[in-house]
């Protein structure tokens, strides 16, 4: 899969789970860098991935809500991320400055099911996103306009 960022360091990856969706996220940010990410798969938190330290922000997805697009910002390390959901919400982690890239699936209807990348002592050097179809296909109605920020808002 495609990786964003300069790369280098140890590899990390969320657990491949064919039975659960991503239901929550924890992202730790410190010294203007994203230090680590952690996903909740069903009712259980997966292992924390990345470097130590930082302040942790936690977000919970609603039932039937999925992450459908991600913006990432790099300046040597991962500086920030914005995650957009199928319910027209977004979660903002860190600062969106530096080299900004967007990640989204090639298939209509696919959602975020995993995160992988590389990290060093100070933080995340590269990140990639695994997309797949949700376990239960929603009967999709046009989204309700809701916004939520785990930090500062960002324009859609």
């Amino acid at each position: 899969g495609k990786m964003y960022g300069p790369g280098g360091g140890k590899y990390f990856s969320t657990t491949e789970d064919y039975d659960h969706e991503i239901t929550g996220l924890r992202v730790s940010v410190g010294l203007l860098l994203v230090k680590s990410v952690q996903v909740k798969l069903g009712d259980s938190w997966d292992v924390k991935l990345g470097a130590l330290g930082g302040n942790t922000q936690e977000v919970t997805l609603q039932p039937g809500e999925y992450i459908t697009k991600v913006f990432v910002a790099f300046q040597a390390f991962l500086r920030g991320m914005v995650m957009y959901t199928s319910k027209d919400r977004y979660f903002y982690f860190g600062k969106l400055d530096g080299q900004i890239s967007s990640a989204y699936p090639s298939q209509e209807g696919q959602v975020l099911v995993g995160i992988y990348g590389q990290y060093q002592l100070l933080g995340i050097k590269s990140i990639g996103f695994e997309w797949n179809y949700p376990l239960e296909e929603p009967t999709t109605e046009p989204p309700v306009n809701l916004t939520y920020s785990a930090n500062s808002p960002v324009g859609r």
């Epitope: 298939q107 179809y133 949700p134 376990l135 296909e137 929603p138 009967t139």
Partner: antibody, heavy 121, light 112 residues
Framework: QVQLKQSGAELVRPGALVKLSCKAS????????MHWVKQRPEQGLEWIGW????????IYDPKFQGKASITADTSSNTAYLQLSSLTSEDTAVYYC??????????????WGQGTLVTVSA | DIVMTQSPSSLAVSAGEKVTMSCKSS????????????LAWYQQKPGQSPKLLIY???TRESGVPDRFTGSGSGTDFTLTISSVQAEDLAVYYC????????FGAGTKLELK
């Protein structure tokens, strides 16, 4: 009800470019990806690409990269397909399509009537 | 690229006959996560736009007569029309939605 109304037939010179339109009614294109499909005379169907009109994100079949450009105007609820450097190989009917509401996967339940593009000197 | 191969390319039938047509993909369309096959069947009558008949290999689209049945898994799929009617004369295309989107070349159903 959902309708996709496409622009009329085009006769264009080799090397020129053409821009086709697909005007949606009965739904807001911001809520659905819009796909384009090519059908050459007496031949099968080829998927060209899609656009997410809400943010302009696009994906193309690699063989149409550089040939096709998909855009959308949410204010007029219209998707567009621009084809450049036209040759006789581009002579075809072009369809816009949208998925069903019952599933988020791209099963094309709604189709435009098609636009015939003829490339001829 | 996933290649979709349909056979036969044409089929001459009489009204009331049972007909089957095949679609093979160059790689499995069974998603190990969702356990669904990302294959659809479309019908295209002369001078008309295609019409969705079946998706997920075997789910009939709303309003499609139950004489149309989709089956198969992995790389081998079949569309069966239990009793062909005159209005079924058309070209039938399979399409994968597993990795980007690819159509087969079609099977043309003609009257004997």
């Amino acid at each position: 009800q959902v309708q996709l109304k496409q622009s009329g037939a085009e006769l264009v010179r080799p090397g020129a470019l053409v821009k086709l339109s697909c005007k949606a009614s009965g739904f807001n294109i911001k809520d659905y990806y819009m796909h384009w499909v090519k059908q050459r005379p007496e031949q099968g169907l080829e998927w060209i690409g899609w656009i997410d009109p809400e943010n302009g994100n696009t994906i193309y079949d690699p063989k149409f990269q550089g040939k096709a450009s998909i855009t959308a105007d949410t204010s007029s609820n219209t998707a567009y397909l621009q084809l450049s450097s036209l040759t006789s190989e581009d002579t075809a009917v072009y369809y816009c399509a949208r998925r069903a509401i019952t599933t988020a996967t791209a099963w094309f339940a709604y189709w435009g009537q098609g636009t015939l593009v003829t490339v001829s000197a | 690229d996933i290649v979709m191969t349909q056979s036969p390319s044409s089929l001459a039938v009489s009204a009331g006959e049972k007909v089957t047509m095949s679609c093979k993909s160059s790689q499995s369309l069974l998603n190990s996560r969702t356990r669904k096959n990302y294959l659809a069947w479309y019908q295209q009558k002369p001078g008309q736009s295609p019409k969705l008949l079946i998706y997920w290999a075997s789910t009939r689209e709303s309003g499609v007569p139950d004489r149309f049945t989709g089956s198969g898994s992995g790389t081998d799929f079949t569309l069966t029309i239990s009793s062909v009617q005159a209005e079924d004369l058309a070209v039938y295309y399979c399409k994968q939605s597993y990795n980007l989107y690819t159509f087969g070349a079609g099977t043309k159903l003609e009257l004997k």
